[in-house]
């Protein structure tokens, strides 16, 4: 059974992930981002189901394309380079989902824009955090 300290650690990691995803969303929605139209044409895969930490596998698998799409934006839109930002997210995701079990991600038939993709994972984080508090 999860201890209160492990629950607290999970909550902090989810809050960190949530802030990183919100920061990306704010950066790309910045009115000074001339590449937003272009970025919105890229189609991301969305999870069929995202209710448990193991479902973060679906986010992990889309982090590389996310980095490459973010590379289009001017770096001043973000505090960190996309490479470092995604690397940080990857570390958190790996810790949260764990590596004990290999979960095969199932994707929805419909793809999403970068904004829809980020909003979906932001909602996921908020939902899991609410169950922990």
């Amino acid at each position: 059974a999860p201890t209160s300290s492990s629950t607290k650690k999970t909550q902090l990691q989810l809050e960190h992930l949530l802030l990183d995803l919100q920061m990306i969303l704010n950066g790309i929605n910045n009115y000074k981002n001339p590449k937003l139209t272009r970025m919105l044409t890229f189609k991301f895969y969305m999870p069929k189901k995202a209710t448990e930490l193991k479902h973060l596998q679906c986010l992990e698998e889309e982090l590389k394309p996310l980095e490459e799409v973010l590379n289009l934006a001017q770096s001043k839109n973000f505090h960190l380079r996309p490479r470092d930002l995604i690397s940080n997210i990857n570390v958190i995701v790996l810790e949260l989902k764990g590596s004990e079990t290999t979960f095969m991600c199932e994707y929805a038939d419909e793809t999403a824009t970068i904004v829809e993709f980020l909003n979906r994972w932001i909602t996921f984080c908020q939902s899991i955090i609410s169950t922990l508090t």
Epitope: R38, T41, F42, K43, Y45, E61, E62, K64, P65, E68, L72, C105
Partner: antibody, heavy 118, light 107 residues
């Protein structure tokens, strides 16, 4: 890390067929298209076609239409390119390359030399 | 089908030189162009995507520009490892098409 590992060199007679494989690892195979590109000795790169491993959908360059077939086996993360009715002009190095929308071809296989000779 | 015309077909330059290679598309391809470097006996390597975006790990001396039908690849200060053949690739529509290549040689 992402890797595309292709099958070994082949020597074929004119009129025969060749099937080249491309085994993907280090990423979700169904999330990226597989493209096939060939290069004759001392020549440029020539795009042959693409396949979506998720749906199995394919698209071929007009030049190869009717002679090329691109397939996949998702259970072993492997893509295949079969070229039939081989002629000497098909002697080339054949590459598979991973692609997704406008990101271009970010990872390539090491290449497979196919020699067509009587 | 879209034709890609690359120029020059070959180019001699020295270490430290600034070099520019041009690619022209037969119709508007927006920003859907990539640049690839190939060394003898090796697979091509992606240098630029979406006309001007550098993937992680590609040195900043490489840069791309252009949109529509005219594109350029610039190497700001040639290094010994940059002597290779360069190709442009349009990924705007099917069939995809490459430029004929530019061989960059040591002067």
């Amino acid at each position: 890390q992402v890797q595309l590992v292709q099958s070994g060199a082949e020597v074929k007679k004119p009129g025969a067929s060749v099937k080249v494989s491309c085994k993907a690892s280090g990423y979700t195979f169904t999330n990226y298209d597989i493209n096939w590109v060939r290069q004759a000795t001392g020549q440029g790169l020539e795009w042959m076609g693409w396949m979506n491993p998720n749906s199995g959908n394919t698209g071929y360059a007009q030049k190869f239409q009717g002679r090329v077939t691109m397939t996949r086996n998702t259970s072993i993360n492997t893509a295949y390119m079969e070229l039939s009715s081989l002629r000497s002009e098909d002697t080339a190095v054949y590459y598979c390359a991973r692609g997704r929308q406008w990101l271009g071809f970010d990872y390539w296989g090491q290449g497979t030399l196919v020699t067509v000779s009587s | 089908d879209i034709q890609m015309t690359q120029s020059p077909s070959s180019l001699s330059a020295s270490v430290g030189d600034r070099v520019t290679i041009t690619c022209r598309a037969s119709q508007d391809i927006e920003h859907d162009l990539g640049w690839y470097q190939q060394k003898p006996g090796k697979a091509p390597k992606r240098l630029i995507y979406a006309a001007s975006t550098l993937p992680s790990g590609v040195p900043s001396r490489f840069s791309g520009s252009g949109s529509g039908t005219e594109f350029t690849l610039t190497i700001s200060s040639l290094q010994p490892e940059d002597f290779a053949t360069y190709y442009c690739l349009q990924h705007n529509s099917f069939p995809r098409s490459f430029g004929q290549g530019t061989q960059l040689e040591i002067k």
